[in-house]
């Protein structure tokens, strides 16, 4: 399990164990049940970021 | 309907590469999650898992057999090879491809398999 | 590499009674939201088939007397009530990280 802080993920995809593969936070919704969706939502998306800096 | 089939070249001898192919149908290895592994059983015995490979050319591979493993896609023609080299009376098997896929509850474990093709190594 | 051991080797078990495989893993394969454990049948001269997925999760047109539980090390596969068509050999078959592996199997006879 990746711990956190140390995702080898790029902004927007998070680390998937499954797949050993980091996977685009984007196909969450239609798939919320992957094990990569957990770090997805643990962080707000870029653009929300920008919106409350 | 989703359906692979497994091909190669039946009989081979000790130090040659090994050639497989998997031809499959009812999905497309351009879909998002999408991937394709191979695995061996030699006959009576288990299962080894040898190498995966997405839709987007990433590729994986067990370790034990790495340095003598190369996996690729065709997606148009909707084909996934392996080449292994070097092969030995060890590598004698049944070889199958299979599907891993997205769904709903996130990524199927090797949910289609083809039928296998048997491979004998043997000077 | 996880190695999975499975128990026993073989068994044979009663029309209707309940077949129990036990599949152990050399570390864990479960996270705190997640246990990738995976079961399949194989009968001879088959591909093999996948009947449960995460632990628990009935593949699509698998009986409901197949049931998997278990997590972190420890994992089970049951079938109850057994019928004939259920001879085979089970595997499992952890996603938790690479390389992939598949226990030994469980040959499973049909009294």
């Known amino acids: 399990e990746q711990a956190p802080g140390t995702s080898p993920c790029s902004s927007g995809s998070s680390w998937s164990a499954d797949l050993d593969k980091c996977m685009d936070c984007a196909s969450c919704p239609a798939r919320p049940h992957s094990d990569f969706c957990l770090g997805c939502a643990a962080a707000p998306p870029a653009h929300f970021r920008l919106l409350w800096p | 309907q989703v359906s692979l089939k497994e091909s190669g070249p039946g009989i081979l001898q000790p130090s040659q590469t090994l050639s497989l192919t998997c031809s499959f149908s009812?999905?497309?290895?351009?879909?998002?999650?999408?991937?394709v592994s191979w695995i061996r059983q030699p006959s009576g015995k288990g299962l080894e898992w040898l190498a995966h490979?997405?839709?987007?050319?990433?590729?994986r591979y067990n370790p034990s057999l790495k340095s003598r493993l190369t996996i690729s896609k065709d997606t148009s023609r909707n084909q996934v090879f392996l080449k292994i080299t070097s092969v030995d009376t060890a590598d004698t098997a049944t070889y199958y491809c299979?599907?891993?896929?997205?769904?709903?509850?996130?990524?199927?474990?090797?949910?289609?398999w083809g039928q296998g093709t048997s491979v004998t190594v043997s000077s | 590499d996880i190695v999975l051991t499975q128990s026993p080797a073989s068994l044979a078990v009663s029309l209707g009674q309940r077949a129990t495989i036990s599949c152990r893993a050399s570390?864990?394969?479960?996270?705190?939201?997640?246990?990738?454990m995976h079961w399949y049948q194989q009968k001879p001269g088959q591909p093999p088939k996948l009947l449960i997925k995460?632990?628990?999760n009935l593949e699509s047109g698998v009986p409901a007397r197949f049931s998997g539980s278990g997590s972190g090390t420890d994992f089970i596969l049951n079938i109850h009530p057994v019928e004939e068509e259920d001879a085979a050999t089970y595997y499992c078959?952890?996603?938790?990280?690479?390389?992939?592996?598949f226990g030994g199997g469980t040959k499973l006879e049909i009294k």
């Open positions: 299979a599907r891993r896929g997205p769904d709903y509850y996130g990524y199927y474990p090797m949910d289609y």
């Open positions: 009812g999905f497309s290895l351009s879909t998002s999650g999408m991937g």
């Open positions: 490979i997405y839709w987007d050319d990433d590729k």
């Open positions: 570390k864990s394969v479960s996270t705190s939201s997640y246990s990738y």
């Open positions: 995460y632990t628990s």
């Open positions: 078959q952890h996603s938790r990280e690479l390389p992939w592996t």
